[in-house]
Interface confidence: medium
Amino acid sequence: YNNFRKSMDSIGKKQYQVQHGSCSYTFLLPEMDNCRSSSSPYVSNAVQRDAPLEYDDSVQRLQVLENIMENNTQWLMKLENYIQDNMKKEMVEIQQNAVQNQTAVMIEIGTNLLNQTAEQTRKLTDVEAQVLNQTTRLELQLLEHSLSTNKLEKQILDQTSEINKLQDKNSFLEKKVLAMEDKHIIQLQSIKEEKDQLQVLVSKQNSIIEELEKKIVTATVNNSVLQKQQHDLMETVNNLLTMMSTSNSAKDPTVAKEEQISFRDCAEVFKSGHTTNGIYTLTFPNSTEEIKAYCDMEAGGGGWTIIQRREDGSVDFQRTWKEYKVGFGNPSGEYWLGNEFVSQLTNQQRYVLKIHLKDWEGNEAYSLYEHFYLSSEELNYRIHLKGLTGTAGKISSISQPGNDFSTKDGDNDKCICKCSQMLTGGWWFDACGPSNLNGMYYPQRQNTNKFNGIKWYYWKGSGYSLKATTMMIRPADF
């Protein structure tokens, strides 16, 4: 029974084998299920942990050692039982087979057994002492880890705070990288898709031609209406002139006509009796130069001159300084009225600015500024705003004091970067600021996490791109 060996079986259990005479005894000691092997994967996000990694590793190692200790204890108990059983068996054999003249042999065997028992007991005591020492040392280590945990937790909290700050800083760059990746993908595709894009271009041109044809029809109808209104107006003027008895109070009918149909803004159009929404021809102050604008004659009492509209992404707002100066787009759809006209108009008298916004969830909000004007082109059409009210945020999403206007070819912002190129569209960028209603148009369910979208920060946050926007002005004394 001194022949003893330890091995591993095919399923990983420890095997203890004792040879006794012709008999062989094998003990299969179980492994604990909750003891993870060091090779098993264990991945965790260090930022979100409750305790430091080192502490968890120690606890894990302690569990392993405790399991080993438990296995050792089980083995020792079985070994003790085995020795005791063997002693009993051998004693019985000695008693049965002994004769008077074999006493010395029996004593020798008894002595050997006692010596072996003493040896095993001594070994047991040594193992127990080692296990106790190991346990004490582990308890001390665990106590040290427990004491350092608070310190480490505090460090982790500090690190988490720092990481959050860095994440905020990185967020913008990550989005920029995504945009660049997007552009990169498009560039990689462009060679293969040249033929396809030409087909798309032809299709697009056909649809544009069709749309233009529709618009020509609409314009012709509008023109006919305007001609009829002009004709009716002429008749009224002529009737009035006829009714006047004194020749010295009579005026040249041509002059009367000019005075009546020359409107500076939609408020004047409204006051002249035209109370229907639509496109009207306005005249620059102190000039004969004309511009077409959409007039909202219904919202909030009417008389609003629409200076900007976004609604479906059909117009490209990444335009040059000159285009933003003179205006672009279609007054019945998406358009920019023109900085020069708005500047001249708002420097003649006091105007209010109303910005009406729609999100993709069916909500609407507005910001109303009680005093609005644009500086001249020499001062880069700088925006001036006072007295904010409305539902689209208590803080102005157009930075205060007002900034100069910037476009892709006219960088007047306060950022070392070029906000207009990066965020797209012309706007009164700060560095780059909390708004841009001339950004990229993104449709529903693709309108979040978009740094270059149609933004009004103090209503929907930085990454939300709006569904529709309208900027409108009206005299403050309307």
Epitope: E181, Q197, Y441, Q444, Q446, N449
Partner: antibody, heavy 117, light 107 residues
Framework: EVQLVESGGGLVKPGGSLRLSCAAS????????MNWVRQAPGKGLEWVAE??????????HYAESVKGRFTISRDVSKNTVYLQMNSLKTEDTAVYYC????????WGQGTLVTVSS | DIQMTQSPSSLSASVGDRVTITCKAS??????VAWYQQKPGKAPKLLIY???TRWTGVPSRFSGSGSGTDFTLTISSLQPEDFATYYC?????????FGGGTKVEIK
């Protein structure tokens, strides 16, 4: 009510061509980014192609498996999006769905394309 | 390409059970994740977009959570009409990719 109706599916031999159509109604078609998504028999969903309005021009994107063989296009006047499929392979066999801006809230009923010799 | 690893691939549950399906993205996708429900022979139906926003008309028992790379769809109390296949999808970058699907069957 939003409606997307696909047509043009059928049986075709490997190497052959098909043109799928999707007629849309009930939403601002011009602003939506239209997509084709397919589903092979007993398999999961696979995005195929997208056409998106980017300011005043259209931009297209394709899955790697169809790039160079499939072409997505649209006709705004007809509120219709197309998928021209050339050099068809047996692995292109699937139900093809037309859907709007991804993630797609509006889907057609699907049209079955079978590529077999 | 961004891989969307969905688990489990199938599960058996009873009416009234709370069911959780997870989706792991191979890259950071912000909150640009959607969840769909599909029944045999039918087109998919949008349940959740932007990781946690319910689409119009979707019952409140469906909820989504997560951001970055780990996302979850939860059905708080499974109803008979909820037995179907569920897919996650990332719309953060091209090519747009779907998860492999999770079939929810009656126990």
């Amino acid at each position: 009510e939003v409606q997307l109706v696909e047509s043009g599916g059928g049986l075709v031999k490997p190497g052959g061509s098909l043109r799928l159509s999707c007629a849309a109604s009930g939403f601002t078609f011009r602003a939506a980014w239209m997509n084709w998504v397919r589903q092979a028999p007993g398999k999961g969903l696979e995005w195929v192609a997208e056409i998106r309005l980017k300011s005043n021009h259209y931009e297209t994107h394709y899955a790697e498996s169809v790039k160079g063989r499939f072409t997505i296009s649209r006709d705004v006047s007809k509120n219709t999006v197309y998928l021209q499929m050339n050099s068809l392979k047996t692995e292109d066999t699937a139900v093809y769905y037309c859907t709007d801006t991804q993630p797609g809230a509006y889907w057609g009923q699907g049209t079955l394309v079978t590529v077999s010799s | 390409d961004i891989q969307m690893t969905q688990s489990p691939s199938s599960l058996s549950a009873s009416v009234g059970d709370r069911v959780t399906i997870t989706c792991k993205a191979s890259q950071y996708v912000f909150t640009d994740v959607a969840w769909y429900q599909q029944k045999p022979g039918k087109a998919p139906k949008l349940l959740i977009y932007w990781a946690s926003t319910r689409w119009t008309g979707v019952p409140s028992r469906f909820s989504g959570s997560g951001s970055g790379t780990d996302f979850t769809l939860t059905i708080s109390s499974l109803q008979p009409e909820d037995f179907a296949t569920y897919y996650c999808q990332q719309t953060s970058s091209y090519p747009l990719t779907f998860g492999g699907g999770t079939k929810v069957e009656i126990k």
